[in-house]
């Protein structure tokens, strides 16, 4: 089966000032919950859009 | 080499819970997850759920929320799946099966045949 | 969930023939990494499940070259060129692209 949480990434080229780490998938670190029917494309593109937000609010020199 | 050695045969009533056992060896526990399979001859295989024994982090079938709860203990290499409120529903054979990225060699458990009967 | 249908349900064969699994998905298996993750896997009688085939068509180590893997998008086929009478048992494609993972009905292959 393939990994959900230890999966290999392809990294998101960003500015070298930020670091992003966030998975891609169904992730929950308690053992009580999880799951959801989200595609991967899906989630993969709500990722990008988050990080592109987060991009945005960085205050860039004059 | 590799091995993932489930725990035997279980016969349980109606309504109460079982916990499963899956022991890897032959590799380091925590750089692998661990996923579980349910096998019946009416629904054939499916996906329960995933654990990564790192961290504790879990995933789970939609399905089997409520019903399955994965752990792992990292001292022994040995995860762990509590099935409750068993009804005959849950009479299955269920297999552990070594996480990968998609490619990398795939390992199952010989398989743990689970009866719920009064 | 993705639907994962695979034909034909039993397939009986004479040893030395060939043979020919489909398997359709309800949505394209093509990931946003640009892989597709359909595997297969054999089933032997009173056996775990050993997966033969991942990526669509590369063969796991060991698997005999008579059986290749193709298709892409939606549509999968497993094919063995010379069926020999080792490869009885039921034959199951996968998909873990889309959570959460699924898997088709299942094939049985008997030998004529």
């Known amino acids: 089966m393939r990994n959900i949480f230890k999966r290999n990434q392809e990294p998101i080229v960003a500015p070298a000032t930020t670091t992003a780490t966030m998975p891609i998938g169904p992730v929950d670190n308690s053992t009580e919950s999880g799951g959801a029917g989200e595609s991967q494309e899906d989630m993969f593109a709500k990722l990008k859009e988050k990080l592109f937000n987060e991009i945005n609010k960085i205050p860039l020199p004059p | 080499q590799v091995q993932l050695q489930q725990s035997g045969a279980e016969l349980v009533r109606p309504g109460a819970s079982v916990k499963l056992s899956c022991k890897a060896s032959?590799?380091?526990?925590?750089?692998?997850?661990m996923h579980w399979v349910k096998q019946t001859p009416v629904h054939g295989l499916e996906w329960i759920g995933a654990i990564d024994p790192e961290t504790g982090g879990t995933a789970y079938n939609q399905k089997f929320k409520g019903k399955a709860t994965l752990t792992a203990d990292k001292s022994s290499s040995t995860a762990y799946m509590e099935l409750r409120s068993l009804t005959s529903e849950d009479s299955a054979v269920y297999y552990c099966?070594?996480?990968?990225?998609?490619?990398?060699?795939?390992?199952w458990g010989q398989g743990t045949s689970l009866t719920v009967s009064s | 969930d993705i639907v994962m249908t695979q034909s034909p349900l039993t397939l009986s064969v004479t040893i030395g023939q060939p043979a020919s699994i489909s398997c359709k998905s309800s949505?394209?298996?093509?990931?946003?990494?640009?892989?597709?993750?359909l595997n297969w896997l054999l089933q032997r009688p009173g056996q775990s499940p050993k997966r033969l085939i991942y990526l669509v068509s590369k063969l796991d180590s060991g698997v005999p070259d008579r059986f290749t893997g193709s298709g892409s998008g939606t549509d999968f086929t497993l094919k063995i060129s010379r069926v020999e009478a080792e490869d009885l048992g039921v034959y199951y494609c996968?998909?873990?692209?889309?959570?959460?993972?699924?898997f088709g009905g299942g094939t049985k292959l008997e030998i004529k």
């Open positions: 996968w998909q873990d692209t889309h959570f959460p993972y699924t």
């Open positions: 099966t070594r996480g990968n990225d998609g490619y990398n060699e795939d390992y």
């Open positions: 032959g590799y380091t526990f925590t750089d692998y997850e």
């Open positions: 949505q394209s298996l093509l990931d946003s990494d640009g892989k597709t993750y």
